[in-house]
Interface confidence: low
């Protein structure tokens, strides 16, 4: 199945010459960015990007690796060092603090410097660090958070919250002692720390009092409100803004995004995390691409520009389950959202960054033939005379011993969306990995994204590009036609 044209050196020389020509034309823009978008693929290490690229191509009946993801088209790339102050291999809380606030913190803390200690409420005050989103809001821009996880989850929370424990989603999750010391749950901080114009994702149950039935699953008590303080945070949020709208299904989201009277939009489409793309009820829940489009429609009305955080948050969850099919289909939807955002914005005035918070112990190897399924088997057998998949995990729940041995695997088994790829070490949940992740950049000041950098550099590039604190004296020309 090797394409005949690829046997000819001219094919490669011509392709490389075209790429070189495009590279020679790259001119660093001297203008400031009116808009900032950061696309965060949670757990989207480089092996995930490569495997998703192949899957995206194969879904279009191509061989795979020659395909371009939307993120592949971004002209500038750097590597980001993801370690947290206390761990070689980080979590999504400490990393969110790095790329959104520009300061590294400790494992499982959010929006706090490393002077704060995990789970110790009394180390919160005085150690708060301010996100680029918060600074953008202070500069008069509209701001938004879009995610496929709970909106109170670690990554989006980095944009607005300060907490010593990323698991404090609602007040029911906060120990009484911490509540008495004044530590607030993340859901409360979502509506009270700053004015966020667009909030889209999951996480309904953390916003409503215990005993409140969920509108989508009214008979399932476990999906209902969790709050002990009796507060209806959605109603409190609605009461703050004259043009505020709350939606919980796709139809109402699409309507609200086109309604000129809506100035603030909160859409919470599941009680907890949103469903995986492969399980999504497309009549009730919007896709990440649709949420991104809705957010951009609202935010782009502001002549001063906007800041938007878009997270493909369940790439990470698929990997933790050792279900590569889920992780990779989530990555493709994430990439589709990047592509749609590119169609709705201009690289003349919008700095777009794509990165991951951390990687996973996910590998792609075994010399598979070009064009063979990304979920398929490596050629030949392993030393135990059994087949093995080209996708594997270093650790995780895919480790199984059957009569003291590794189970054999067939192509039909490994192609199942529910299949867990095997691992070397048995764990309930597969772990993050510590290698550097990619940062892709396009738009004003994207040329600053180069080399091997600390993850904190990302927040500083965004702040500088838009002349936000502490770079208000950035000395960048405003984009031609910018209005105030």
């Amino acid at each position: 199945i090797i394409p005949v044209e690829e046997e000819n050196p001219d094919f490669w020389n011509r392709q490389a010459a075209e790429a070189l020509g495009a590279a020679k034309k790259l001119q660093p823009a001297q203008t400031a960015a009116k808009n900032l978008i950061i696309f965060l693929g949670d757990g989207m290490g480089v092996s995930t990007v490569t495997a998703a690229r192949i899957l995206k191509g194969q879904k279009k009946d191509k061989l795979g690796p020659e395909t371009f993801l939307a993120m592949d088209r971004f002209p500038y790339v750097a590597l980001s060092k993801t370690y947290s102050v206390d761990k070689h291999v980080p979590d999504s809380g400490a990393t969110a603090t790095a790329y959104l606030c520009g300061v590294k913190g400790n494992f499982q803390t959010i929006g706090l410097s490393a002077a704060a200690r995990f789970n110790q409420c009394n180390t919160t005050r005085g150690n708060e660090v301010i996100s680029v989103m918060n600074r953008a809001k202070k500069a008069g821009k509209s701001v938004g958070v879009v995610t496929t996880t709970r909106v109170q989850h670690a990554s989006p929370a980095g944009a607005y919250a300060h907490t010593v424990n990323r698991n404090w989603y609602s007040d029911a999750d906060v120990p009484a002692s911490a509540r008495q010391e004044g530590c607030q749950d993340i859901a409360t901080q979502l509506i009270s720390n700053m004015d966020i114009d667009v909030i889209l994702g999951g996480g309904r149950k953390y916003m409503f009092p215990m005993g409140t039935p969920d509108p989508e699953y009214p008979d399932d008590y476990s999906q209902g409100g969790t709050r002990l303080d009796g507060k209806n945070l959605v109603q409190e949020w609605l009461a703050k803004h004259q043009g505020a709208r709350y939606v919980w299904n796709r139809t109402e989201l699409l309507q609200a995004s086109l309604d000129p009277s809506v100035t603030h939009l909160m859409g919470l489409f599941e009680p907890g995390d949103m469903k995986y793309e492969i399980h999504r009820d497309s009549t009730l829940d919007p896709s990440l691409m649709e949420m991104t489009e809705a957010a951009l429609l609202l935010l782009s009305r502001n002549p001063r520009g906007f800041f938007l955080f878009v997270e493909g948050g369940r790439i990470d969850h698929g990997h933790h389950e050792s279900r590569a099919y889920r992780a990779l289909t989530e990555t493709i939807m994430f990439d589709d959202a990047i592509e749609r955002a590119g169609q709705l914005t201009s690289e003349e005035d919008t700095l777009s960054l794509v990165t991951a918070d951390h990687s996973h112990v996910f590998s792609f190897g075994g010399y598979p033939l070009r064009g063979s399924s990304i979920f398929g088997l490596a050629p030949g057998k392993a030393r135990d005379r059994k087949a093995y998949t080209v996708l594997l995990y270093g650790n995780g729940p895919g480790y199984v011993l059957k009569d003291g041995a590794r189970p054999d695997v067939t192509e039909s088994e490994s192609g199942s969306p529910e299949y867990r790829q095997q691992s070397a070490v048995p764990l309930d949940g597969e772990t993050h990995a510590g290698e550097d992740v990619a940062v892709f950049a396009r738009g004003p000041q994207a040329h600053l994204v180069h080399g091997v950098q600390e993850q904190t550099f990302i927040a500083h590039v965004m702040a500088f590009a838009a002349c936000l604190e502490p770079y208000t004296a950035c000395d960048l020309a405003p984009r031609a036609g910018t209005t105030d």
């Epitope: 409503f208 209806n232 109603q235 009461a239 703050k240």
Partner: nanobody, 122 residues
Framework: QVQLVESGGGLVQAGGSLRLSCAVS????????IGWFRQAPGKEREFVAR????????RYDDSVKGRFTVSIEDAKNTAYLQMSSLKTEDTAVYYC???????????????WGQGTQVTVSS
């Protein structure tokens, strides 16, 4: 678009009870709250009761407090107004409405049902 259809009205003797239903279709949003209003012949429409979609806030007009109860059954997308100890002055066309709260404008009701007649005879 949200549609509301009332039912359950009729003729009842003073001191009796009636239960009005308001079926909501078009998947009423969670930030829409159900209000009940009534309009007696020759009078303006007046507020009777309201309940937030999640049941966290309920309010009654003083004239019906202790006699009327508003409830919402999410599973059926239906709101109810249980009326007991009815008086002749409760005679009116009863309407349900879906509304939202804003700090600037207070409660506003965007969607209305067609109304159901309640007649209380002595």
């Amino acid at each position: 678009q949200v549609q509301l259809v009332e039912s359950g009205g009729g003729l009842v003797q003073a001191g009796g009870s009636l239960r009005l239903s308001c079926a909501v279709s078009g998947r009423a949003l969670s930030d829409y709250n159900i209000g009940w209003f009534r309009q007696a012949p020759g009078k303006e429409r007046e507020f009777v009761a309201r309940k937030t979609w999640d049941g966290s806030s309920t309010r009654y007009d003083d004239s019906v407090k202790g006699r009327f109860t508003v409830s919402i059954e999410d599973a059926k997308n239906t709101a109810y107004l249980q009326m007991s100890s009815l008086k002749t002055e409760d005679t009116a066309v009863y309407y349900c409405a879906a509304g939202r709260y804003s700090r600037a404008r207070g409660w506003e009701y965007d969607y209305w049902g067609q109304g159901t007649q309640v007649t209380v005879s002595s």
